[in-house]
């Protein structure tokens, strides 16, 4: 058993049929010393008397708002949150694997730049009696700081039967130089809650492995004199790292008819102009990526060639 | 990738074009790494992230962009002499402090290429012939050395006479393939940043 | 006493489809990952499909992929595997379990 | 994909003996291994879990050891009721993969 925050504690169980569960004791925080009685949740029911209260916990039933009284009044709380360790592993059924990009990945972080800011996101099937908080630092051992703000609902989906529910989180390193090479990763751990379940989740990666520019800004089209062909030109995302000569990009510029089954003429480079030919009905799209370390490849910036 | 390449214009910074061929050589050598040693901790996220080149050279911090000096968080107090006289500075005129990122470079390079052919040359004596260096990549950091020409004492290569464990040499390539190939991207980084300059 | 009991097992052709049912009890069936594994004739033990307590979370074999679902209704105790374009290599013993403890398993026989 | 590869596939052995089966995952699985006990014509049934740990009412005289890629089930005195064929099992990726089962007869 630990504490989580004050008058909060987790009780950890190896969690199957018929498993011996762990025995607790709680202790009533007053100075008095008599007349104690003890109680869970709203129920009136007295479960023991004294300053302790010695319980097996061993199931959800088991756990709950302890409270102890002294002649009808309330002397302090404890409650129990129960952390359930199926078969030498810790549950995970508040969170939905989103299996990108492999098995039990529950949370996914992205950074738009080297600045040292990202964000986190996670999706759950659950739409009440839900909390979340998130910590993060640099490295585990001798952790240097990351400032998280508070999770919030950012999008709900209906998938299926099911609700699906998206909360995210924005993380800053307090002193990142986006020239550094990171020789220690990120990890981000968020604190699951749902009614008396606790779950933690943690994610542990380098800020250049989770890069994925913003799509490029201004595309336009300029077509060329007596040509079919035209001049695509675009600029750097105002979000990615400056200066732009040292944080370079790659562009690909992709030309796609109305049709999905139509071939796609693709363009790679470095520059933030190319020539293509603009076939009628058709769009011309350019995505980003770091020029020099692969991470992810911006959503697309689309222009239709008319 | 497979990109098409851009070839370098004769007036170009010397030192762009051999830093973008050291890039792809080092990532190839890595991916090919992956591959053949899948059994392996050689993944970014089960090997530690050692830097040997960590308080003898400080080419982060002496090939700061100017933008970013103005970060506290980029200032580093460790400084480093280093000499001073390289045909990349050739044709322009160079601050102190250019120069002093340049001879990191090639001190780096110089560390890299010593650790390499050491290790290199046990994993030529292991019996599973599983995997060797990749020479084109040996030949780039040579070739971008050259091009830096920066005077420095020569570093015999290192021998050890203990029979080589093959297991945790194939274990260290992954890590100094992996901490070489981040010092690659910064080095390219700053070639393409000098170059616009 | 903690019990799984697996149904809806028997003959049936290739392509054909089945829907399996185990009906669990003496435990709070609700806050438990439940598991189908299969035993063809002979032979050693397969994993199949996996569920999370609350549904959230389910896992498939490269074998049954896109075939088989795996779903659950907590408030009849019951886990469910549904499986459909059934396969020759499909046949074996099906069982239900929520680890110490396992259902005495249904046979499912794929046989033109 | 994981691949556990059990041995023997299959001993003799007498009451009383100790008796040792041994099971080597292809990659480092961490503890993420169980043991099943399953006799002729019945379901299995879990003995060990998380390398070492016994479910409770699973008699004493079985232990499990192991970490990372070897692992180990000990029974430290046979029982008649022992003769069985066990299986380990990884569950520390998917798919969850079990060994090929390890046959133990009466000499």
């Known amino acids: 058993i630990w504490e989580l925050k004050k008058d909060v504690y987790v009780v950890e169980l190896d969690w199957y049929p018929d498993a011996p569960g762990e025995m607790v004791v709680l202790t009533c925080d007053t100075p008095e010393e008599d007349g104690i009685t003890w109680t869970l949740d709203q129920s009136s029911e007295v479960l023991g008397s004294g300053k302790t209260l010695t319980i097996q916990v061993k199931e959800f039933g088991d756990a709950g708002q302890y409270t102890c009284h002294k002649g009808g009044e309330v002397l302090s709380h404890s409650l129990l949150l129960l952390h359930k360790k199926e078969d030498g592993i810790w549950s995970t059924d508040i969170l939905k694997d989103q299996k990108e990009p492999k098995n039990k990945t529950f949370l996914r972080c992205e950074a738009k730049n080297y600045s040292g800011r990202f964000t986190c996101w996670w999706l759950t099937t659950i739409s009440t009696d839900l909390t979340f908080s998130v910590k993060s630092s640099r490295g585990s051992s001798d952790p240097q700081g990351v400032t998280c703000g508070a999770a919030t609902l950012s999008a709900e989906r209906v998938r299926g039967d099911n609700k699906e529910y998206e909360y995210s989180v924005e993380c800053q390193e307090d002193s990142a130089c986006p020239a550094a090479e990171e020789s220690l990763p990120i990890e981000v751990m968020v604190d699951a809650v749902h009614k008396l379940k606790y779950e933690n989740y943690t994610s542990s990666f380098f800020i250049r492995d989770i890069i994925k520019p913003d799509p490029p800004k201004n595309l336009q089209l300029k077509p060329l004199k007596n040509s079919r062909q035209v001049e695509v030109s675009w600029e750097y995302p105002d979000t990615w790292s400056t200066p732009h000569s040292y944080f370079s990009l790659t562009f690909c510029v992709q030309v796609q008819g109305k049709s999905k089954r139509e071939k796609k003429d693709r363009v790679f480079t470095d520059k933030t102009s190319a020539t293509v030919i603009c076939r009628k009905n058709a769009s011309i799209s350019v995505r980003a990526q770091d020029r020099y370390y692969s991470s992810s490849w911006s959503e697309w910036a689309s222009v239709p060639c008319s | 990738r497979n990109l098409p390449v851009a070839t370098p214009d004769p007036g170009m910074f010397p030192c762009l074009h051999h830093s973008q061929n050291l890039l792809r050589a080092v990532s190839n050598m890595l991916q090919k790494a992956r591959q053949t040693l899948e059994f392996y901790p050689c993944t970014s996220e089960e090997i530690d992230h050692e830097d040997i080149t960590k308080d003898k050279t400080s080419t982060v911090e002496a090939c700061l962009p100017l933008e970013l000096t103005k970060n506290e968080s980029c200032l580093n107090s460790r400084e480093t002499s280093f000499i001073t006289n390289g045909s990349c500075l050739a044709s322009r005129k160079t601050s102190f402090m250019m120069a002093l990122c340049l001879s990191s470079i090639y001190e780096d390079l110089k560390m890299y290429q010593v650790e390499f052919k050491t290790m290199n040359a046990k994993l030529l004596m292991d019996p599973k012939r599983q995997i060797f260096l990749d020479q084109n990549m040996l030949a780039v950091i040579d070739e971008l050395m050259q091009a830096l020409n920066f005077n420095s004492e020569t570093v015999p290569q290192k021998s050890s006479l203990e029979e080589p464990d093959f297991y945790k040499t194939k274990i260290k390539l992954c890590i100094l393939l992996h901490a070489f190939r981040i010092r690659a991207v910064t080095i390219d980084r700053v070639m393409s940043y000098l170059n616009a300059s | 006493e903690v019990q799984l009991v697996e149904s809806g097992g028997g003959l049936v052709q290739p392509g054909g489809s089945l829907r399996l049912s185990c009906a669990a009890s003496g435990f709070t069936f609700s806050d438990y990952g439940m598991v189908w594994v299969r035993q063809a004739p002979g032979k050693g033990l397969e994993w199949v499909a996996s569920?999370?307590?609350?549904?959230?979370?389910?896992y498939y074999a490269d074998t049954v992929k896109g075939r088989f679902t795996i779903s659950r209704d907590n408030a009849k105790n019951t886990l469910y595997l549904q499986m459909n374009s059934l396969r020759a290599e499909d046949t074996a013993v099906y069982y239900c379990?929520?680890?110490?403890?396992w259902g005495q398993g249904t046979l499912v026989t794929v046989s033109s | 994909d994981i691949q556990m590869t059990q041995s023997p596939s299959s001993l003799s052995a007498s009451v009383g003996d100790r008796v040792t089966i041994t099971c080597k995952a292809s990659?480092?699985?961490?503890?993420?291994v169980a043991w099943y006990q399953q006799k002729p014509g019945k379901a299995p049934k879990g003995l060990i879990y998380?390398?070492?740990h016994r479910y409770s009412g699973v008699p004493s005289r079985f232990s499990g050891s192991g970490s990372g890629t070897d692992f180990t089930l000990t029974i430290s005195s046979l029982q008649p009721e022992d003769f069985a064929t066990y299986y380990c099992q990884q569950y520390n990726s998917y798919p969850l993969t079990f060994g090929g089962g390890t046959k133990v007869e009466i000499k």
């Open positions: 998380s390398a070492s």
């Open positions: 990659q480092n699985v961490g503890t993420n």
């Open positions: 569920i999370s307590s609350g549904s959230s979370n389910i």
């Open positions: 379990a929520r680890n110490p403890y």
